[in-house]
Every structure is written in C-alpha cells, then in structure tokens.
C-alpha cells in the first residue's frame, strides 16, 4: 500500500493537482486514513476512487456478469467497464439487464440500424419511414453494478 502525505505542497505534483482548495481530501485512487493524516492507495484490480474524496474506504470494483464482456479493467482510479455481449443490449431505462436484440423486423418494415451493445435493431416502415419499437424479451441475467455508480457504462 502506498501512502501519500496530505501536506498541500506535496499535493501540488502535476498528476495530483488539486481541483479545489478544500483541505482533508485525497486524490483519485486513494482514500483517507482513519486519523485523516494520510492518503492510502486503493488496491489495484480490487477497489478504486474516481475523484478527490474523504472516503474511509475505496469502492469495490465491479465484476462483469455472465452475458457481459469486460471492455476496460478496473484501475485504482476507474471502475470496470462492462458491455453486453454480442446480440444483446442495455437500455437506458433498465440498465441492470442485457436484453436480447430482435432478430428481424416485422413484415412491411426494413432494418435501418443493427444491434449494438447500447441499442436494439431499428426498423422503419418501407413507405413512410416511421420508426417501430417492439417488445424486447429480457435475458435472465442481472448486471452487477458498483454501489454509487450507474450500471457499468457501455462506452
């Protein structure tokens, strides 16, 4: 575990430049010690902190669930990024589950957009070009999310 003094002059190092003059905060990748005198580094691959903080503990790294792929591993300053696997997508309104993409468009409609980890296929009426959104079956899978953060970002 690496420790870093809370001395403001030590904090002036370029990679840990303060974003506010408030004392008693530790930089991303660290949490504060119990006596508030030191910043203790998070454990790489286990936990993290993303911003200046006075956390007693770093946040646990998200573990990608089955049905997801890890696109970025957890570092001490950034949580894991999990993405729905091919053929499934995560909707904004229900980010906790990856849903199966539709396999095709209803009769009289044409596909204008493929399935991505962030969206279902998009179908429009051949003549009018009006969009169609159908019911999407849920995959029986829950996404593990990290407390305090939105369900794993999909970028």
């Amino acid at each position: 575990i690496t420790r870093q003094s809370l001395d403001p002059q030590r904090r002036a190092a370029p990679q840990q430049k303060r974003s506010s003059p408030t004392e008693g905060l530790c930089p991303p990748g660290h949490h504060i010690s119990e006596d508030s005198r030191e910043c203790i580094s998070c454990k790489y691959g286990q936990d993290y902190s993303t911003h200046w903080n006075d956390f007693l503990f770093c946040l646990r790294c998200t573990k990608c669930d089955s049905g997801e792929v890890e696109v970025n591993s957890c570092t001490t300053t950034r949580n894991t990024v999990c993405q729905c696997e091919e053929g499934t997508f995560r909707e904004e309104d229900s980010p906790e589950i990856c849903r199966k993409c539709r396999t095709g468009c209803p009769r009289g409609m044409v596909k204008v957009k493929d399935c991505t980890p962030w969206s279902d296929i998009e179908c429009v009426h051949k003549e009018s070009g009006t969009k169609h959104t159908g019911e999407v079956p849920a995959v029986e899978k829950t996404v593990t999310t990290s407390p305090g953060t939105p369900a794993s970002p999909c970028s």
Partner: nanobody, 124 residues
C-alpha cells in the same frame, strides 16, 4: 437493492455485552461498505463503526474504540457489531447502513440503504 434488518438489541447492565446483527437481502451485499450508527433519545444520529466491502479495513469512532468490534460474513450477507464493556451512554437505537463508502464523518457515498434499527438500553 439491499434490504437491511437489525437484531440483537435489548436491555443489559453496565459492563455487559451485546452482539448486534444486520441481515441483508440482495445479491450485491459484498459490494458495499457497511456501517453502524446510533441515535440516543433527543440526540442526532452518530457514526459508530464501519468496514469496507471485504471486511479487511475497519473504522471506529473514538468513544467505542477498544470496546466495539465490527465484522461481516459475506457468505451469510450479515454484518455484526460486538459491543463489550457497555456504558449507560451507549443507550440508543442502533442502525446499520450499506453504501459504496463512508466519509470520515459518516456521510454515505453513493446509493445508501438503512435498516429500521434495534434498541440497546444499558442500565447503570
């Protein structure tokens, strides 16, 4: 989402011991830091103790150091507060809380979940 239910409170004489339990439902219990807080009649809620998601790191407020021990069993989705050498001033409703982390002052970070509390009364 996590639901928390405390138990183990009761009436005990000064110098006695109690073990509080906080049972959590929800598969993400082990992602959360857990804390114990207390509120004495007519007083503000006070941060007592906390531990991180793995149980490897703990924090205690000065007034309970050496007397209280916080621990967790992630397999049982339960966090405990072992209270020894109890004093009349420990009398309060004890609440358990789950959050991503806690600040030095006990402020929860991220989504936080709270139990309804269990009453501890220490008679002199």
């Amino acid at each position: 989402e996590v639901q928390l239910v405390e138990s183990g409170g009761g009436l005990v004489q000064a110098g006695g011991s109690l073990r509080l339990s906080c049972a959590a439902s929800g598969r993400t219990f082990s992602n959360y830091a857990m804390g114990w807080f207390r509120q004495a009649p007519g007083k503000e809620r006070e941060f007592v103790a906390a531990l991180n998601w793995s149980g490897g790191s703990t924090y205690y407020v000065d007034s309970v150091k050496g007397r209280f021990t916080i621990s967790r069993d992630n397999a049982k989705n339960t966090v405990y507060l072992q209270m020894n050498s109890l004093k009349p001033e420990d009398t309060a409703v004890y609440y358990c809380a789950a959050a991503g982390s806690f600040s030095l002052g006990g402020r929860p970070y991220g989504d936080d979940y709270w139990g309804k509390g269990t009453l501890v009364t220490v008679s002199s």
